[in-house]
Amino acid sequence: QRFAQAQQQLPLESLGWDVAELQLNHTGPQQDPRLYWQGGPALGRSFLHGPELDKGQLRIHRDGIYMVHIQVTLAICSSTTASRHHPTTLAVGICSPASRSISLLRLSFHQGCTIASQRLTPLARGDTLCTNLTGTLLPSRNTDETFFGVQWVRP
């Protein structure tokens, strides 16, 4: 029981349970398709335990297999808007280091204004995840409509 109590006092990171849940801060300047994220208890239902934010992009601190999830809702949109401003796509990938650059998720809005997806993928310490929104439509900053996160699952 003493061990259980001690374990409860350990931070999640030390147990290998790296986890982050982020909300949208802002979109990039012209010619930068990246979404810039923010996280932390001061923002409400948002946190970082292990991973950290580097200029709005999520950087992994522990090797392992992670569940990556994302939802993006377009604020200025409609079923016809989405197709008229085609193609509006969301891509999540490792953007640095360059040697590990790869796309992990690619989604198209087609005839909807919200996309959501998740997948399991191996990530390594130092991997930075970028989320690119291409197209002219604007994403909502509402915290229940647009969010991004990772959860360490196993080594």
Epitope: H26, T27, G28, P29, Q30, Q31, D32, A75, I76, C77, S78, T80, T81, R84, C113, T136, L137, L138, P139, S140, R141, N142, E145
Partner: antibody, heavy 120, light 108 residues
Framework: EVQLLESGGGLVQPGGSLRLSCAAS????????MSWVRQAPGKCLEWVST????????FYAESVKGRFTISRDNSKNTLYLQMNRLRAEDTAVYYC?????????????WGQGTLVTVSS | EIVLTQSPGTLSLSPGERATLSCRAS???????LAWYQQKPGQAPRLLIY???SRATGIPDRFSGSGSGTDFTLTISRLEPEDFAVYYC?????????FGCGTKVEIK
Amino acid sequence: EVQLLESGGGLVQPGGSLRLSCAASGFTFSVYAMSWVRQAPGKCLEWVSTISGSGGSTFYAESVKGRFTISRDNSKNTLYLQMNRLRAEDTAVYYCARHDYSNYAYFDYWGQGTLVTVSS
Amino acid sequence: EIVLTQSPGTLSLSPGERATLSCRASQSVRSSYLAWYQQKPGQAPRLLIYGASSRATGIPDRFSGSGSGTDFTLTISRLEPEDFAVYYCQQYGDLPFTFGCGTKVEIK
């Protein structure tokens, strides 16, 4: 206190050009999408154009597409509307309006408007 | 394009009375993305309600919004002298953003 102040309106002949400005203060201008909305005398409100906070995305009403250009200078906290090939039906009070922070196109603050009259 | 039809065109009421304004959309408004504005002569519109039912900052609780889909209502529970104005609805779920042509609330 959020303030939006339009300028640049006036009398112009059909086919002419005019550039409207909207000086913003009291908030972090570059974070907010902005729009122009117009109201012809005694008529309904009509959305004209929208620009994202970064300036990278622009949207136009069909009635002004190809004639009007929306732009912004975030270093000067100023929104612009370049109006070319003006028509009599463009006569209206032009308001600049700030979008809600979440990017949604309801307008939480409006300027007092500037009158554009297109007449020969 | 979503067309918004407001009714009645004019509402003649006395201070203290209840005002019920209607806004009907030609097609369903996404996620109730509908706003209401108040405009007085010579002034810019002022945001009252967004998301069909959320009151904007500083708006008295006598103003309330309801509805979803294609039918929306703005209610002023007890009219104050400063409430006599024109009221517009606006949908922002679809480009182009569109406004109704207004309901004028005048003193009876």
